[in-house]
């Protein structure tokens, strides 16, 4: 009983349950390969509980090991489009602070129009994650086709 | 010590650890795109702890944010089969109650024979998830090739 | 307050937060389809908290339901390479003890150069997971392209 009460009284954030699921807001100008994300209940099924958005990029607020996952679908795409525009590549990485810059997850589209993957990685408070889509093809903004999220797993 | 004892005394369900991993039972008749799932230790490595099956569809018993994941492999498939039968598409969504009907996750096979993805999404008690495979190709029933699951992550 | 203190005093391992994320060390000789993994902070962003490596294979230390995930990218690959060398298949399974040997997750590359998937599965203390890559193509050792991990989810 005491544990159950304590669990209810403590804010969820103190249990380390940071989590976010984002939907695509927009792509950058020609020279900027980054995808810009948005989240919040007003937008549908996206949300941020702990992490924050900084100019469309996801900033971590709690140290720990996170499960990072992403799916990106190309907007106007067939297997011939994908192969003709190859290489189209999606990379998720820490883009700031610069001292911690690293690529965490990378996939190419080849003859497919969707990539989806996930991985566990240590992240620190202040790490900003960027998702770079290189190539000329544009991502779909459909919320069931393109999304990006993180889930705190353990300290 | 007190916390450890309390944790052991509380049923797991009260900690919100709802989780399910399902294997394919069967496909519907021609006009029904839904996949019908089954789970339980007698069937192998599938299980339901919290969620339930309602006529082969997964029904949620606890409000919260869930990680939903799926992999579907086509039974008789090569890259030429997949492209010739295009579009073959897999969509996971809330199909009931009708007021909450929405597509959560969508992927096309293009020239591939397997799709796999995952996402975080809020689900409510009573939500039923349906997995629709549109097209003429049939999914593999091998338990290491086709599976569908959810994991409660936080309130 | 009492719960928060207790939580801090208990070792994380007692909460069942076993987790590992591995990077590719090397492939085996011609007749051995297994991938050999490595992990640890000295190697970059890979780690083992609970599970252990036994000759490059991942051994589980705690009973429970785990989320198993993997991504493998082929090293020198285009869609034509992948289709010409078909079938190239990745399977994750329990390889020891022999009495529990089973394939958990299987994907073919077809015309793609990367596979990525995840699933929930019960694992027991002492289970060793093997990842078999069949075919003649070699995997990339880039840490953002090829990785394998597990996360304890619940008892």
């Amino acid at each position: 009983q005491r544990f159950a009460q304590a669990q209810q009284q403590l804010p969820l954030e103190s249990l380390g349950w940071d989590v976010a699921e984002l939907q695509l807001n927009h792509t950058g100008p020609q020279q900027d390969p980054r995808l810009y994300w948005q989240g919040g209940p007003a937008l549908g099924r996206s949300f941020l509980h702990g992490p924050e958005l900084d100019k469309g990029q996801l900033r971590i607020h709690r140290d720990g090991i996170y499960m990072v996952h992403i799916q990106v679908t190309l907007a106007i795409c067939s297997s011939t489009t994908a192969s003709r525009h190859h290489p189209t590549t999606l990379a998720v990485g820490i883009c700031s602070p610069a001292s911690r810059s690293i690529s965490l997850l990378r996939l190419s589209f080849h003859q497919g129009c969707t990539i989806a993957s996930q991985r566990l990685t240590p992240l620190a408070r202040g790490d900003t994650l960027c998702t770079n889509l290189t190539g000329t093809l544009l991502p779909s903004r459909n919320t069931d086709e393109t999304f990006f999220g993180v889930q705190w797993v353990r300290p | 010590q007190r916390f450890a004892q309390a944790q052991q005394q509380l049923p797991l369900e009260s900690l919100g650890w709802d989780v399910a991993e399902l294997q394919l039972n069967h496909t519907g008749p021609q006009q029904d795109p839904r996949l019908y799932w089954q789970g339980g230790p007698a069937l192998g490595r599938s299980f339901l702890h919290g969620p339930e099956l309602d006529k082969g569809q997964l029904r949620i018993h606890r409000d919260g944010i869930y990680m939903v994941h799926i992999q579907v492999t086509l039974a008789i498939c090569s890259s030429t089969t997949a492209s010739r039968h295009h579009p073959t598409t897999l969509a996971v969504g809330i199909c009931s109650p009708a007021s909450r009907s929405i597509s959560l996750l969508r992927l096309s096979f293009h020239q591939g024979c397997t799709i796999a993805s995952q996402r975080l999404t809020p689900l409510a008690r009573g939500d039923t998830l349906c997995t629709n495979l549109t097209g003429t190709l049939l999914p593999s029933r091998n338990t290491d090739e086709t599976f569908f699951g959810v994991q409660w992550v936080r309130p | 307050q009492r719960f928060a203190q207790a939580q801090q005093q208990l070792p994380l391992e007692s909460l069942g937060w076993d987790v590992a994320e591995l990077q590719l060390n090397h492939t085996g000789p011609q007749q051995d389809p297994r991938l050999y993994w490595q992990g640890g902070p000295a190697l970059g962003r890979s780690f083992l908290h609970g599970p252990e490596l036994d000759k490059g294979q991942l051994r589980i230390h705690r009973d429970g339901i785990y989320m198993v995930h993997i991504q493998v990218t082929l090293a020198i690959c285009s869609s034509t390479t992948a289709s010409r060398h078909h079938p190239t298949t990745l399977a994750v399974g329990i390889c020891s003890p022999a009495s529990r040997s089973i394939s958990l997750l299987r994907l073919s590359f077809h015309q793609g150069c990367t596979i990525a998937s995840q699933r929930l599965t019960p694992l027991a203390r002492g289970d060793t997971l093997c990842t078999n890559l069949t075919g003649t193509l070699l995997p990339s050792r880039n840490t953002d392209e090829t990785f394998f991990g597990v996360q304890w989810v619940r008892p």
Epitope: - | Q23, N25, H26, T27, G28, P29, Q30, D32, Q38, A42, L43, G44, T136, L138, R141, T143 | -
Partner: nanobody, 116 residues
Framework: QVQLQESGGGLVQPGGSLRLSCTAS????????MEWYRQAPGKQRELVAI???????NYADSVNGRFTISRDNAKNTLYLQMNNLKPEDTAVYYC??????????WGRGTQVTVSS
């Protein structure tokens, strides 16, 4: 314990036809799927055709448009009608009965040889 027995194989000239049958010793009504496989010498067993309990069918690229799978629950029999046969169709053909609970039953096979 269901037992399956294939029949209908034999020697046929290229362009010819054969109809394979697979008869079950018990009811096939509980089969979620019934399938025909084939195995040519020195090759892996290949899934050729599927019919589901709902009547849906799928075929391998190599036989699509030439082979037709069907099932007759009343006769506890699965069929494979093979038309316009080619030398590369030469193989041992096996039927498989797959129950909802993942219990599978296999036949012992029937040889099909396509040669002039």
């Amino acid at each position: 314990q269901v037992q399956l027995q294939e029949s209908g194989g034999g020697l046929v000239q290229p362009g010819g036809s054969l109809r394979l049958s697979c008869t079950a010793s018990g009811s096939i009504f509980s089969a979620t799927r019934m399938e025909w496989y084939r195995q040519a010498p020195g090759k892996q067993r290949e899934l050729v055709a599927i019919v589901t309990s709902g009547g849906r069918t799928n075929y391998a690229d190599s036989v699509n448009g030439r082979f037709t799978i069907s099932r007759d629950n009343a006769k506890n029999t699965l069929y494979l009608q093979m038309n316009n046969l080619k030398p590369e169709d030469t193989a041992v053909y096996y039927c498989k009965f797959e129950r909802y609970d993942y219990v599978n039953y296999w036949g012992r096979g029937t040889q099909v040889t396509v040669s002039s």
